[in-house]
Interface confidence: medium
């Protein structure tokens, strides 16, 4: 740091004074010197370091008419809104010829009410769930002692007793306010008041209770909600993304979820209008007058298979002597699962009905008993999944084959001598 030489008398005739005040104070430091010849630029030092961006003004007044006469130079340093960083020892510095001169020091001090570096923040917490609040204040003067208040009631007998920078709250059952008082020798400052809103705890134990092809019944255990009864719970379901799935805790599903509201109690809901044999992810949140809980993690569930909702379409049945050719198309109605095959039933007017499992083929050639003289032969077809048979088609009478009609050759299926199954017509 520059130091004044003692070889010549100091040019300074006025040195900086002292300022002590509270934060935000505005003040001015002033130094004055008398020099012969051209006036020098006055620099300001704080704690021995030149202030490059000081808010200073310099006034120069000649004492004679000649440039070589004496000049009075006054430099003023303005401190606006006093802060802790402004405190320290201040001096003026000038370079005269080959020499450096510094003034006597003046001091800037900060002393007043405590100043908050950190105040408690508004937040939401789940009922009966521990959390921490923070508060930090400083002087000078030190020490600064804190006193926490809950709903305007002090949590200790006096400042400095009880928790200081961090307040641990073991849990709340109602929305509450918290503030902190900072005390020092100059008095007390009160922080902002933080509102801690008590929300219901996240529901637990979300699980499937029952499943049907197009609906799932789910149940959960509600979390505690403090003094505020739950008003409803909201359940979201989303189609799983073909193996990609939704990771536990993932904030957003890949598509818009189906949202349902459940009155509570009971903590149970039937989700309808779902697709059969389809994976979903579900989650639930519950709401009180104070707001909603957090969502549970996404839970993977799956609807079971159902039976086909309609019979096979466009059934055609023709006979040519002792052979009958039947073909059909897959049901237009939803299959509600994986198609495993078709069942075919046929019956004559005075003969027992016969039930056959055709598999996944959509056509079959039947070898009828005798010469095919059985009268009024009708055929029905049904599709089936793992869940069972769909509805049977209406009976289709066998039409006689006409020349010109295609008669594909297929594996012949002999009619069993006794019916394999009895179908109630």
């Amino acid at each position: 740091a520059p130091r004044g030489t003692q070889a010549e008398e100091s040019p300074f005739v006025g040195n900086p004074g002292n300022i002590t005040g509270a934060r935000g104070l505005t003040g001015t430091l002033r130094c004055q010197l008398q020099v012969q010849g051209e006036p020098p630029e006055v620099h300001w030092l704080r704690d021995g370091q030149i202030l490059e961006l000081a808010d200073s003004t310099q006034t120069q007044v000649p004492l004679g008419e000649d440039e070589q006469d004496d000049w009075i130079v006054v430099s003023q340093l303005r401190i606006t809104s006093l802060q802790l960083s402004d405190t320290g020892q201040y001096q003026c510095l000038v370079f005269l010829g080959h020499q450096t001169f510094v003034s006597q020091p003046g001091y800037v001090g900060l002393e007043g009410l405590p100043y908050f570096l950190e105040e408690p923040e508004d937040r939401t917490v789940a009922a009966n769930t521990p959390f921490n609040l923070s508060c930090q204040a400083q002087g000078p003067p030190e020490p600064v002692d804190l006193l926490w208040l809950q709903d305007a009631v002090p949590l200790a007998t006096a400042p400095g007793h009880g928790p200081q920078r961090s307040l641990h709250v073991p849990g709340l059952n109602k929305t509450s306010s918290f503030s902190c008082e900072a005390h020092n020798a100059k008095g007390v400052t009160t922080s902002r008041t933080a509102t801690i809103t008590v929300l219901p705890q996240q529901p637990r134990n979300l699980h499937l209770v029952s499943r049907q092809p197009t609906e799932l019944e789910v149940a959960w255990t509600p979390g505690l909600s403090g003094i505020y009864p739950l008003t409803h719970c909201t359940l979201q379901a989303v189609l799983s993304d073909d193996g990609m799935g939704i990771q536990a805790g993932e904030p957003d599903p890949p598509e818009e979820p189906l949202t349902s509201q459940a009155s509570v109690p009971p903590h149970q809901l039937r989700l309808g209008s779902l697709h059969p044999h389809t994976p979903y992810h579900i989650r639930v949140a519950c709401t009180s007058s104070q707001g909603p809980s957090s969502w549970t993690h996404w839970l993977p569930v799956e609807t079971p298979e159902g039976v086909p909702l309609g019979p096979p379409e466009n059934i055609s049945a023709t006979r040519n002597g002792s052979q009958a050719f039947v073909h059909w198309q897959e049901p237009r109605a939803p299959l509600q699962g994986t198609l495993l095959g078709y069942r075919l039933a046929y019956q004559g007017q005075d003969t027992p009905e016969v039930l056959m499992d055709i598999g996944l083929r959509q056509e079959v050639t039947l070898e009828l008993q005798g010469d095919g003289s059985v009268s009024n032969l009708t055929v029905c077809v049904a599709a089936y999944t793992a869940a069972g048979d769909g509805p049977w088609s209406l009976p289709v009478p066998l039409e006689a084959w006409r020349p010109g009609q295609a008669q594909p050759v297929h594996q012949l299926v002999k009619e069993p001598s006794t019916p394999a199954f009895s179908w109630p017509w």
């Epitope: 637990r204 699980h207 209770v209 499943r211 049907q212 569930v301 079971p304 298979e305 793992a386 869940a387």
Partner: antibody, heavy 122, light 107 residues
Framework: QIQLVQSGPELKKPGETVKISCKAS????????MNWVKQAPGKGLKWMGW????????TYADDFKGRFAFSLETSASTAYLQINNLTTEDMVTYFC???????????????WGQGTSVTVSS | DIQMTQTTSSLSASLGDRVTISCRAS??????LNWYQQKPDGTVKLLIY???RLHSGVPSRFSGSGSGTDYSLTISNLELEDVATYFC?????????FGSGTKLEIK
């Protein structure tokens, strides 16, 4: 291999409390729920409920609400069944059975403990 | 609660026989039907889940079938070690419920 080992037979007086343990090994204990099943001598099986081993949340069947409590010691991969205020009706065998994945109980009970018989006699 | 009914409380069959044990649910359980075997020493094992899926280590002579409310367990080639009581259980709806059991003996 997966194993559930239950504590040995118990002889208790009416009004006393019994606590049966079920120690699991061979799998991640907290991934799969634990069911408890009751069987009276020469009778069928009756599901008592299950405990979510991830959250510790128990679910009791209606007939087992009150005197029965499921609990866990996760660090020891052990589930417990406690029965308070024993009566002669409780003189049966109790099974633990590994079950549902995380929060979903609707899975088969694929591994069972060997059973613990409780005798209640004054 | 869903009632599970096993009408045959006991049956006797010869070694090598094909044995079928039936189970009926009081309502549709959407194929969530499990079969358990309890040996005379009391040990319980899962045999079959979701109607017909064999649990690991279960011999292939065991099979299951059915849908809706009616289900059955078949042992195709009865062996001595199959002497046990067999229970069905629905896993569709809480609370889980079991059938009363069918005790299988050798003639």
């Amino acid at each position: 291999q997966i194993q559930l080992v239950q504590s040995g037979p118990e002889l208790k007086k009416p009004g006393e409390t019994v606590k049966i343990s079920c120690k699991a090994s061979g799998y991640t204990f907290t991934k799969y729920g634990m069911n408890w099943v009751k069987q009276a001598p020469g009778k069928g099986l009756k599901w008592m409920g299950w405990i979510n081993t991830y959250t510790g949340e128990p679910t009791y069947a209606d007939d087992f609400k009150g005197r029965f409590a499921f609990s866990l010691e996760t660090s020891a991969s052990t589930a417990y069944l406690q029965i308070n205020n024993l009566t002669t009706e409780d003189m049966v065998t109790y099974f633990c059975a590994k079950g549902g994945y995380y929060s979903n109980p609707i899975y088969p009970m694929d591994y069972w403990g060997q059973g613990t018989s409780v005798t209640v006699s004054s | 609660d869903i009632q599970m009914t096993q009408t045959t409380s006991s049956l006797s069959a010869s070694l090598g026989d094909r044995v079928t044990i039936s189970c009926r649910a009081s309502q549709d359980i959407n194929n969530y039907l499990n079969w358990y075997q309890q040996k005379p020493d009391g040990t319980v094992k899962l045999l079959i889940y979701y109607i017909s899926r064999l649990h690991s280590g279960v011999p292939s002579r065991f099979s299951g079938s059915g849908s809706g409310t009616d289900y059955s367990l078949t042992i195709s080639n009865l062996e001595l070690e199959d002497v046990a009581t067999y229970f069905c259980q629905q896993g569709n709806t809480l609370p889980f419920t079991f059938g009363s059991g069918t005790k299988l003996e050798i003639k």
